[in-house]
Amino acid sequence: PEPPTACREKQYLINSQCCSLCQPGQKLVSDCTEFTETECLPCGESEFLDTWNRETHCHQHKYCDPNLGLRVQQKGTSETDTICTCEEGWHCTSEACESCVLHRSCSPGFGVKQIATGVSDTICEPCPVGFFSNVSSAFEKCHPWTSCETKDLVVQQAGTNKTDVVCGPQDRLRA
C-alpha cells in the first residue's frame, strides 16, 4: 500500500507512518512504529501540556509574581497552565497577563462608563450636558445636575461637566 501523505485528526506523520498524538497532560517518549503504539508519559507536578501533541518536554506552569501585582486565579493542572490575574485595584497589561498596572481614574468632567476588572482598565466617558463629575475616581459615574425645580428653587449658577448647578430661592415679586 501507498504510504500516507496526510493523517487523521490527533495523528501525525512520521517515517511515512501515521502515529497517534499524545493527549493533553502527556508528552512524547517515542514515536510509533509498524509494531508499536506511540509512547507517551504524563507531565509531572508543576508541568502541563494543553493540546494533543508530540512535544518531548512538558511546559512549566506560569508563576504569578506578586512583585508584579499578580496573583493566581486558577492553579495549573497537567492539562492547563496557571491562570494569573491582578491584585485588587490593578489590571493586566496584556492578554497573557504578565504584569499589572494600577486602574486609571476618570478626571473631573469624566465619569466611569465601565469599572475596571482584573483584565481590563477603567473606561471613562465625558459627562454630557446635564451631568457632572467633580472628583477623580475609578468608580464614580457622572451624576445628574440637581433639579432645582423639584425643590421649588431656581438655578442661581449653571452647572458644568465638573460642577453641579447651584440652586437658590425664587425672587418674591413685591406688590
Partner: antibody
C-alpha cells in the same frame, strides 16, 4: 518575609497522636500544593503525601495511609499533618514543603522533631 | 510505586574534583528534581525539571538525563558542597526520593 514556619518539637508516648502545623507567610498557600516529608534519625527523605490547601484534596504514600492525615485552614494559611497511633519508628523530623514554580523553587519549613518515647 | 535507586550512597572527594551522582527510576518519569541537604537543615532545591538550575545555585551544578536515568554533576567540588544529595520524581504518586548520596571530604 516569605517562609513556611512549623510548630515546635513534640515528645509523645506510644499510642498517642500528634498534630504538626505549617504556616505560610509572605505568600498565598492556596497557590501551591503542600507536601510532607519524613526524615528518621540518620536516614534519608521519605515522601508522605501532599494536600491542595484550596480544596483539601490529598494524596498519600501507601505506607502513610491511615497513619497520617493532612488538613488545611486557608483562613490562617496553615496546613496540618496529624500522626495517629504513634510508635517509636515514627520518631523523626517532619518537613512541610511546597510545589515549585519557576520563580519560587519551592519553600521548606524548618522541620519539626517528633519523639515517641515511653 | 516508582523505585528511585541513587548511587553511590556515599563518596569521598577533594576540593576541585568532578563529582557525578546517578539516579535510576524503575519506570520512565517526566523529570527529576535534585536537592541538597546539610546536617540539621531543611533540603534545598538545586535542579528542577531535570536540567534547570534553581535561582542562586552555582553553575558548577548541572543535571541531565531522561526516561529512567538521570545524573547530577558538580564540575569542581567546593568546600560548601559537602552535603547529602537526593533525587525525587514528581510524576507518579506516590512521589519518591532516592536513598541519598553523602559527599564527604577525602
Amino acid at each position: 518575609q516569605v517562609q513556611l514556619v512549623q510548630s515546635g518539637a513534640e515528645v509523645k508516648k506510644p499510642g498517642a497522636s500528634v498534630k504538626v502545623s505549617c504556616t505560610a507567610s509572605g505568600f498565598n498557600i492556596k497557590d501551591y500544593y503542600v507536601h510532607w516529608v519524613k526524615q528518621a534519625p540518620g536516614q534519608g527523605l521519605e515522601w508522605m503525601g501532599r494536600i491542595d490547601p484550596e480544596d483539601g484534596d490529598s494524596k498519600y504514600a501507601p505506607k502513610f495511609q491511615g497513619k497520617a492525615t493532612m488538613t488545611a485552614d486557608t483562613s490562617t494559611s496553615t496546613v496540618y499533618m496529624e500522626l495517629s497511633s504513634l510508635r517509636s519508628e515514627d520518631t523523626a523530623v517532619y518537613y512541610c514543603t511546597t510545589s515549585y514554580y519557576v520563580g519560587t523553587y519551592g519553600y521548606w519549613g524548618q522541620g519539626t522533631l517528633v519523639t515517641v518515647s515511653s | 510505586d516508582i523505585q528511585m535507586t541513587q548511587s553511590p550512597s556515599s563518596l569521598s572527594a577533594s576540593v576541585g574534583d568532578r563529582v557525578t551522582i546517578t539516579c535510576s527510576a524503575s519506570s520512565s518519569v517526566s523529570y527529576m528534581l535534585w536537592f541538597q541537604q546539610k546536617p540539621g537543615k531543611a533540603p534545598k532545591l538545586l535542579i528542577y525539571s531535570t536540567s534547570n538550575l534553581a535561582s542562586g545555585v552555582p553553575s558548577r551544578f548541572s543535571g541531565s538525563g531522561s526516561g529512567t536515568d538521570f545524573t547530577l554533576t558538580i564540575s569542581s567540588l567546593q568546600p560548601e558542597d559537602f552535603a547529602t544529595y537526593y533525587c525525587q520524581q514528581r510524576t507518579f504518586y506516590p512521589y519518591t526520593f532516592g536513598g541519598g548520596t553523602k559527599v564527604e571530604i577525602k
